[in-house]
Interface confidence: low
């Protein structure tokens, strides 16, 4: 399987909500011993490998934001810890995997990585990640709502989390 980032850049005004999204596609094994571990973290564009460094999102580590499930099952973080920080990660039946960040501040700007790990019998590891940039802006040049720029050279799109 692979991970696609629908948008490579999100530009948002302060105070807005945004949902960053990755999509898992390709063959997904639905065997009883296969599970998926999905999570989000902040990182930097390393010289060697983007997403190799794992930093917390609003003080929550990638362990705090994880989801577990088999195949393309739906799941979401419901624990208070994430919600208290204005965060929620979710996964749907179609392979979409997202994190919603509420009430954005300038401190939320940076590189975000989604990580998907296929676990077979506890250990065999197939992992892929996607990266996207979030720019939170303030002042007269800030957009009125979030604008997402697709990973390919398509037109930008206005997006705002509910």
């Amino acid at each position: 399987f692979k991970v696609a980032t629908l948008y490579s850049l999100y530009v948002c005004p302060e105070g807005q909500n945004v949902t960053l999204t990755c999509r898992v596609f390709g063959p997904v094994d639905k065997g009883h011993d296969v599970t998926f571990y999905k999570t989000w973290y902040r990182s930097s564009r390393g010289e060697v490998q983007t997403c190799s460094e794992r930093r917390p999102i609003r003080n929550l580590t990638f362990q705090d934001l994880h989801l577990h499930h088999g195949g393309h099952q739906a799941a979401n973080t419901s624990h208070d810890l994430a919600q208290r920080h204005g965060l929620e990660s979710a996964s749907d039946h179609h392979g979409n995997f997202s994190i919603t960040m509420r009430n954005l501040t300038l401190l939320d700007s940076g590189l975000y990585c989604c990580l998907v790990v296929e676990i077979r019998h506890h250990h065999s590891e197939h992992r892929v990640h996607g990266a996207m940039e979030l720019q939170v802006q303030t002042g007269k040049d800030a957009p009125s709502s979030c604008v997402a720029y697709p990973s390919s050279s398509q037109e930008s799109e206005n997006i705002t989390a509910a």
């Epitope: 362990q63 705090d64 810890l81 506890h122 250990h123 065999s124």
Partner: antibody
């Protein structure tokens, strides 16, 4: 702060069983496997096995199958290890340790250890 | 089981010296996914082990850059470029490529 708090020292008679606990705090308990490691005489380390706290899946070192049983209580974020049919060979310090990267076998947080002494 | 052999058993050093610890495995630690799961821990007297290096050469968060790991296949090395007093203790290598995970016998770093 991420912490693993282990239960206190145990003195047991040969043939008895003991159950030691490891209470996790400061992180999402189901986000990483919990491992158990035995240390004899302050020197060698032996991996006993691990448990995925989300599913309860266990993987054991063959050497400890039948000796150790790993369980978790998700509601209290606590992992347990029961050792049965104790002999003097089981006298050691036992550590719980969190797998840093979910299930890849390197441990970033360790408990302080529980000393088990088996003596008649 | 994979046997991990560490040398030397004891390593007397002077503060400021470089120290080098070797770890050999009885079989290759290259996983079928291409990763090599060889890790290093330091255990100070009366404490639990602490992760220093994971997957051969990745320094864990907060570990000083005087620690470095290298190697491949079955042959691995931990180097400390300038030994400080806080580095003293027992160093263990560990593999998690194969189940059961196994540890080396330890190398005690002590003052000469």
């Amino acid at each position: 702060e991420v912490q693993l708090q282990q239960s206190g020292p145990e003195l047991e008679k040969p043939g008895a069983s003991v159950k030691i606990s490891c209470k996790a705090s400061g992180y999402s308990f189901t986000g990483s496997n919990m491992n158990w490691v035995k240390q004899n005489n302050g020197k060698s380390l032996e991996w006993i096995g691990n448990i995925d706290p989300y599913y309860g899946y266990t993987t054991y070192n063959q050497k400890f199958k039948g000796k150790a049983t790993l369980t978790v209580d998700k509601s209290s974020s606590t992992a347990y290890m029961q050792l049965k049919s104790l002999t003097s060979e089981d006298s050691a310090v036992y550590y719980c340790a969190r797998d840093y990267d979910y299930a890849l076998g390197y441990f970033d947080v360790w408990g302080a250890g529980t000393t088990v002494t088996v003596s008649s | 089981d994979v046997v991990m052999t560490q040398t030397p058993l004891s390593l007397p050093v002077s503060l400021g010296d470089q120290a080098s610890i070797s770890c050999r495995s009885s079989q290759s630690l290259v996983h079928s996914n291409g990763n090599t799961y060889l890790h290093w821990y330091l255990q100070k007297p009366g404490q639990s082990p602490k992760l220093l290096i994971y997957k051969v050469s990745n320094r864990f968060s907060g570990v000083p850059d005087r620690f470095s790991g290298s190697g491949s296949g079955t042959d691995f090395t931990l180097k400390i470029s300038r030994v400080e007093a806080e580095d003293l203790g027992v160093y263990f290598c560990s593999q998690s490529t194969h189940v059961p995970y196994t540890f080396g016998g330890g190398t005690k770093l002590e003052i000469k």
